[in-house]
């Protein structure tokens, strides 16, 4: 875990400014677990950051990100009806100035750090139709979603909607 | 103009069926989830059924599992709500209601039909 | 399960008065909430969501706040089409649920 006092003082004042001139509709301070309730935690190793899926033991803190919620319109799709829908994406920051980015080409998820405008390999497209869990599909690459393989965070290619009840792509937040 | 349009309510006995039906246009329907909502006479809201854009996700109130079953047909942008077993504290409008965001349950329910009486009575 | 508490039940006022509803959530959540205005005989209709986004076509005296467990409806300055009942939403959990409601009537 990252041991920063920083990261529980974690405000909405560090994300207060615009990203790509859209402002955040909410943000949110939660801790990150998978579907079988291991955590997600970050830690810094020879000057980055590395992510980690474990089970904490009794007392341990969990780790906490700041979830920042945009609102994003995409285009119809080819039915003709003309109307677009509206959808929710998400950037994930356990600490600041860092965020979580899809590497596409080496399936995995990582920790960068970066200035605004964030890039789009930054923001997850959010799915929370599985009950109370939700999933982070890559803005970069559709039907890819952060996912969970050899205890570490993965990007994961779904095949098919039915497939988004899949455990390892599942993540439950939680504000304790 | 987006719209949805309820039909399938009337007089059933208790212990009777009903299906309701809902046709919606003027939005890509399988992109959205979509809801049951109910509202007994003089009473307030009550929210009933959801059911995932694609059909593989369904959640229900406590008070109707097992006695009421939520579908959808994508291809004739139809939602239906099959009610059976039905009790006397059923009767209510019932209202469908299309999610605010596709892929997501969090923004509430931006877009309603005008409701459909269902009666539960001997 | 959580439950939204609403209140006043109800409150009476005149045109021009500033109105303020609360709701309270029985367990802390996100901004996941949505606020509702209900003419009788007519369905809901969406005003507020995440708290505090105006639905497109929502006059600008409705403002919604808060986050965790306390929100906040606000109507600036009432007009005679908002006298009405007021829901608020939780979209955050299921099941999803609804506050009791709060009837807006005329003084």
């Known amino acids: 875990a990252f041991g920063i006092s920083g990261v529980q003082k974690y405000t909405r004042a560090l994300h207060d400014s615009s990203i790509t001139g859209i402002s955040p509709i909410t943000e949110y301070l939660a801790s990150l677990s998978t579907y079988n309730d291991q955590s997600i935690t970050f830690a810094l190793e020879d000057e980055s950051y590395e992510i980690y899926v474990e089970d904490l033991k009794k007392d341990e803190k969990k780790d906490k990100v700041l979830l920042s919620y945009y609102e994003s319109q995409h285009p119809s799709n080819e039915s003709g009806d003309g109307v677009d829908g509206k959808m929710l994406m998400v950037t994930l920051s356990p600490t600041k100035d860092f965020w979580l980015h899809a590497n596409n080409k080496e399936h995995s998820v990582e920790l960068h750090k970066c200035e605004k405008p964030l890039p789009d390999q930054a923001f997850f497209v959010l799915h929370n139709m599985h009950s109370n869990c939700v999933s982070f599909e890559c803005k970069t690459d559709p039907g890819v979603f952060i996912g969970v393989k050899d205890n570490h965070l993965a990007l994961i290619k779904v095949d098919s909607s039915e497939n988004l009840c899949t455990e390892n792509i599942l993540f439950k937040l939680s504000e304790t | 103009e987006v719209q949805l349009v309820e039909s399938g309510g009337g007089l059933v006995q208790p212990g009777g069926s009903l299906r309701l039906s809902c046709s919606a246009s003027g939005f890509t329907f399988s992109s959205y989830a979509m809801n049951w909502v109910r509202q007994a006479p003089g009473k307030g809201l009550e929210w009933v059924t959801a059911i995932s854009g694609s059909g593989g996700g369904t959640y229900y109130a406590d008070s109707v599992k097992g006695r009421f079953t939520i579908s959808r047909d994508n291809s004739k942008n139809s939602l239906f709500l099959q009610l059976n077993s039905l009790r006397a504290e059923d009767t209510a409008v019932y209202y469908c209601?299309?999610?605010?965001?596709?892929?997501?349950?969090?923004?509430?329910?931006?877009?309603w039909g005008q409701g459909t009486m269902v009666t539960v009575s001997s | 399960d959580i439950q939204m508490t609403q209140s006043p039940s109800s409150v009476s006022a005149s045109v021009g008065d500033r109105v303020t509803i609360t709701c309270r959530a029985s367990q802390g959540f996100s901004s996941w909430l949505a606020w509702y205005q209900q003419i009788p005989g007519k369905a809901p209709k969406l005003l507020i969501y995440?708290?505090?986004r105006l639905q497109s076509g929502v006059p600008s005296r409705f403002r919604g706040s808060g986050s965790g467990t306390d929100f906040t409806l606000t109507i600036s300055s009432l007009q005679p089409e908002d006298f009405a009942t007021y829901y608020c939403?939780?979209?955050?959990?299921?099941?999803?649920?609804f506050g009791g409601g709060t009837k807006v009537e005329i003084k």
């Open positions: 995440a708290a505090s």
């Open positions: 939403q939780q979209a955050n959990s299921f099941p999803l649920t």
């Open positions: 209601a299309k999610q605010t965001y596709t892929s997501s349950w969090y923004g509430g329910f931006d877009i």
